[in-house]
């Protein structure tokens, strides 16, 4: 996977008037490392490793840059014509990447009320607009405003990409200490379901790097893919990741199954615990809508935050 730096910014408007401030977070290689404190109007580290590794100068620079980007986004939102009453959002996701062959990529994506309406390649300055007429209208609105705005020249886009890549390289350098191997903590739980079947769930948490194999084995052999259900590998906010795998088995056959975990060249096998006390119905959480960081703020306002 390429190394990446991603910024997520959002501004809101209520009944046609753009709210002050903005929401923002930053991800380094998919890990949250920055959050913007709206009250203090400052970029702050997210996760212990960001705090430990990246110095005060980082947060000053990030605060300045985000403030400028936030203002740009607010001004753009004021020029979106179709704002009806109620709450609206404009979101920008900006990403730059360094690939293994040292090639680079850069892009930014704009969403209005959670719907993508414009993507730009920061290296070629090419724009892509979805087919829908709403997206076409929004994109035209915004690009017309940018044409009037002297700042939005090709040099500006190039500088934006160069700045992003420079930061990414700097963070990766200072982040050498981060790129250690943290083995996963694995735990297996059962939950009762109907007709003599139980669901066994194996959770791996607090691991780094992200690549992991988690699979159920029966009598020593891996189960087929279609008999297992996997969760996404998600950042847990501490610079590490979490995931899960589940399968349904006949009650009484628990001992034939083991959760097999493979991570960074090491593996472990984790059997199903015995005893009624370990049938945990409370473990049945909905893994599909697990959001991190600032999302709860947006949730309250029923605004979709694109990861």
């Amino acid at each position: 996977e390429p190394h990446s730096l991603r910024y997520n910014l959002m501004v809101l408007s209520q009944d046609g008037s753009v709210q002050s401030g903005f929401l923002a977070e930053g991800h380094l290689d998919g890990q949250p490392f920055l959050r913007y404190d709206r009250q203090k109007r400052r970029a702050k580290p997210q996760g212990q490793w960001a705090e430990d590794v990246l110095g005060a100068k980082t947060w000053d620079t990030e605060t300045e840059d985000l403030t400028e980007n936030g203002q740009d986004l607010r001004r753009t939102l004021t020029h979106i014509k179709d704002q009806k009453g109620g709450l609206h959002s404009l979101q920008e996701i900006r990403v730059c990447e360094i690939h293994e062959d040292s090639s680079t990529r850069g892009s930014r994506h704009f969403y209005y009320d959670g719907e993508l309406f414009l993507s730009q390649n920061l290296e070629t300055q090419e724009s892509t607009v979805p087919q829908s007429s709403r997206a076409q209208t929004l994109a035209m609105n915004v690009t017309n405003f940018w044409k009037e705005d002297a700042m939005k020249t090709k040099t500006h886009y190039r500088a934006m990409q160069a700045d992003c890549l420079q930061k990414l390289q700097r963070y990766l350098k200072s982040g050498v200490a981060i790129r250690r191997t943290v083995p996963p903590m694995v735990n297996v739980t059962c939950s009762e379901v109907s007709e003599g079947n139980i669901t066994v769930t194996c959770r791996a948490s607090s691991f780094y790097p992200r690549n992991i194999t988690l699979t159920w084995r029966q009598d020593g052999v891996s189960l087929s893919h279609n008999t297992q259900q996997w969760g996404d590998v998600l950042p847990d906010g501490n610079g590490t990741y979490q995931t899960w795998v589940a399968t349904r088995i006949r009650q009484g056959e628990e001992q034939r199954f083991t959760c097999y975990m493979e991570h960074s060249g090491n593996h472990g096998t984790h059997p199903v615990p015995s005893g009624k006390a370990l049938v945990l119905q409370s473990q049945r959480t909905d893994h599909h809508h697990h959001h991190h960081g600032l999302n709860d703020i947006f949730e309250a306002q029923k605004i979709e935050w694109h990861e």
Epitope: T213, R217, Q218, D219, G220, V221, S222, Q255, R256, F257, T258, E262, G265, N266, H267, G268, T269, H270, P271, P273, S274, G275
Partner: antibody, heavy 117, light 107 residues
Framework: QVQLQQSGAELVRPGTSVKVSCKAS????????IEWVKQRPGQGLEWIGG????????NYNEKFKGKAILTADKSSSTAYMQLSSLTSDDSAVYFC??????????WGQGTTLTVSS | DILLTQSPASLSASVGETVTITCRAS??????LAWYQQKQGKSPQLLVY???TLADGVPSRFSGSGSGTQYSLKINSLQPEDFGSYYC?????????FGGGTKLEIK
């Protein structure tokens, strides 16, 4: 039928290394984990570690980290254990075995290692 | 690490007798216990797994029982071929340790 055929007895000098092999047959080699066990003369059994022949991933007993290196060759269905910096404490019979879930179902016949000057 | 304490360390019995070997774990191993028999100069052979399931081809005079931290292997009506060493091994969490072994000799 399932068989694990180990290499023959070894007599080696202290400070050297040795590589013991375990050739599997009668089943799909990459489907099961292979474990290694040590037994000193007249003593009990000690689990050294295991390897997934499909991926090469390993799981070592802390006690044997730095002493044993486990590898596997899929093309020949053979698992290997290399023991380094040998001392008389390493003189033992070494077994490979197949992990059949939560128990060891099949064992190799054992390889006797004698470390002597 | 989970420690397995096997007792007795050695045992003399006659053909036809019934013997019991015990294995105590230092923590709950949730029935993930196997018993092996080993004859002099040979590799161990699986007798019982999951604490009480008899392996294929093992005579029914062998039986395993127990749960939590206490497990035992019982051999009814000892036969001449039953003499040798017996080991328990747990598979709850690595390192998978073995008991110290029980040497069963003919009286």
């Amino acid at each position: 039928q399932v068989q694990l055929q180990q290499s023959g007895a070894e007599l080696v000098r202290p400070g050297t290394s040795v590589k013991v092999s375990c050739k599997a047959s009668g089943y799909a080699f990459t489907d099961y984990l292979i474990e290694w066990v040590k037994q000193r003369p007249g003593q009990g059994l000690e689990w050294i570690g295991g390897i997934n022949p499909g991926s090469g991933s390993t799981n070592y007993n802390e006690k044997f980290k730095g002493k044993a290196i486990l590898t596997a060759d899929k093309s020949s269905s053979t698992a290997y254990m290399q023991l380094s910096s040998l001392t008389s404490d390493d003189s033992a019979v070494y077994f490979c075995a197949r992990l059949d879930g939560n128990y060891v179902g099949y064992w190799g016949q054992g390889t006797t290692l004698t470390v002597s000057s | 690490d989970i420690l397995l304490t096997q007792s007795p360390a050695s045992l003399s019995a006659s053909v036809g007798e019934t013997v019991t070997i015990t294995c105590r774990a230092s923590g709950n191993i949730h029935n993930y216990l196997a018993w092996y028999q080993q004859k002099q100069g040979k590799s161990p052979q699986l007798l019982v797994y999951h604490a009480k399931t008899l392996a294929d081809g093992v005579p029914s005079r062998f039986s395993g029982s127990g749960s939590g931290t206490q497990y035992s292997l019982k051999i009814n009506s000892l036969q001449p071929e039953d003499f040798g060493s017996y080991y328990c091994q747990h598979f709850w969490s690595t390192p998978w340790t073995f008991g110290g072994g029980t040497k069963l000799e003919i009286k």
